[in-house]
């Protein structure tokens, strides 16, 4: 059964010239409902009744979920993070097998000197959070671990991580050359095997808000885009006021259709409005009739 | 947690012998690093000797070679230094320390367990 739905409406004009309708419900296609018990299901574009309204999925809203919203929610995180998978041989200690059980009081001690070591390394490097000792075999100590950075998320997080990398190699590569034994003796906290040190990869965190903005969009992902205020990106449509790339429809309201956004233009007591941004307005004549 | 109890010091005339001890409990292991450290009034800490408790290695720092000898008790879990031909230079608090691991360093920062401390005086 087709149900009818009351709905106000504003006269409005597109900028091809036509005039519609454009209520809070969209009426240009008719509204098929169903009864489910004893509620209408009305919801479009994949919405939902949960039996006291539609619940829209993303992009829609409105009580059909039949709009398009100007701006979508995307959460970049707080922080971004890398970690470099790093080796190097220490030579201040004799390995023993005690060293391969990360519970063991050897280990636990090595652990410990290394971590202290590694943060007068890095000290001075603001993104260096910490090392993970991830393995300890023979020869004298070869020390596998991850070196671990983070930083406050900004639109330029990979070239600070980049640079904080390129920073670890230099110190790690000047303290395992500096720090070495004398006579069979080291003078250090810990003495290192300069040609035993190697960068074995570095994974970045990877966060793209553009990638993000375009998933959400689905449909509309050519028409939302990303622009940043205080170091947050924005996923927005022309439609949302107030970025460099909103659409000024002066005289009118914007919406977004799947062919992007566009002016609808208001018609008023004295005046037609036209063009693509509702800039041009005609007079009405004195004795024409509104009805 | 190691516990490092030192025994043993108290004043000796210059050309004079003292043999500390220290004995250690709380390791899990049989195989580890044991140090004597000095520190004379308004200097730095230094090495005196280590030794790695399975015999395989001993360290004596220069200004003791020939006089020190530094040895361990596996038995009795302590660790011993004898001092012979004492000087005036000698004079210090003397620290037993010690590592789980077969430490090669002469560096303080790196021995995580020490005793509270004996002092030598070397005096006429």
């Known amino acids: 059964p087709l149900a009818t739905i009351p709905v106000s409406t504003t006269s409005l004009t597109s900028s091809e010239g036509s005039t519609i309708s454009t209520p809070s419900v969209d009426i240009s296609t008719p509204v098929t409902t169903s009864i489910v018990g004893d509620q209408c299901s009305r919801c479009k574009n994949g919405g939902f009744w949960d039996g006291l309204k539609c619940q829209c999925l993303t992009p829609y809203y409105g009580e059909s979920c039949e709009e398009v919203v100007n701006s979508i929610d995307i959460a970049p995180p707080e922080t971004v993070s890398a970690q470099m998978e790093l080796t190097v041989t220490v030579t201040s200690v004799k390995f023993t097998d005690e060293l391969k059980n990360h519970s063991s009081q050897e280990f636990r001690e090595f652990n410990k000197t290394f971590t202290e070591q590694m943060n007068i390394v890095y000290s001075g490097i603001p993104e260096y959070v910490g090392v993970n000792i991830t393995n300890l075999r023979l020869g004298s100590v070869v020390v596998e671990h991850d070196v671990l950075l983070r930083t406050k998320y900004t639109p330029e997080y990979k070239t600070a991580l980049d640079n904080a990398t390129e920073v670890v190699k230099q110190k790690i590569t000047k303290v395992t050359t500096e720090q070495i034994m004398t006579n069979d003796n080291c003078s250090a906290l810990m003495c290192f095997n300069t040609t035993g040190t190697q960068v074995q990869n570095i994974t970045v965190t990877q966060y793209d808000p553009v990638e993000e903005c375009r998933q959400k969009a689905e449909e509309y992902e050519d028409y939302f885009l990303v622009e940043y205020r205080d170091q947050k990106p924005y996923c927005i449509s022309p439609c949302e006021s107030g970025f460099n790339a909103s659409k000024n429809c002066n005289h009118g309201k914007c919406q977004m259709s799947q062919n992007g956004a566009r002016c609808l233009c208001v018609t008023t007591e004295t005046h037609w409005y036209s063009g693509e941004d509702c800039n041009q307005g005609t007079q009405k004549s004195h004795h024409h009739h509104h009805h | 947690d190691v516990q490092l109890v030192e025994s043993g010091g108290g004043v000796v005339q210059p050309g004079g012998s003292l043999r500390l001890s220290c004995a250690a409990s709380?390791?899990?292991?049989?195989?580890?690093?044991m140090a004597w450290f000095r520190q004379a009034p308004g200097k730095e800490r230094e090495v005196v000797a280590f030794?790695?408790?399975?015999?395989?290695?001993?360290y004596y720092a220069d200004s003791v070679k020939g006089r020190f000898t530094i040895s361990h008790d596996n038995s009795k879990n302590t660790l011993y230094l004898q001092m012979n031909s004492l000087r005036a230079e000698d004079t210090a608090v003397y620290y037993c320390?010690?590592?789980?691991?077969?430490?090669?360093?002469?560096?303080?920062?790196?021995?995580?367990?020490w005793g509270q401390g004996t002092m030598v005086t070397v005096s006429s």
């Open positions: 030794i790695w408790t399975d015999g395989g290695r001993t």
């Open positions: 709380g390791y899990t292991s049989n195989r580890y690093s």
């Open positions: 320390a010690a590592s789980s691991l077969l430490l090669q360093t002469i560096n303080p920062r790196a021995w995580p367990y």
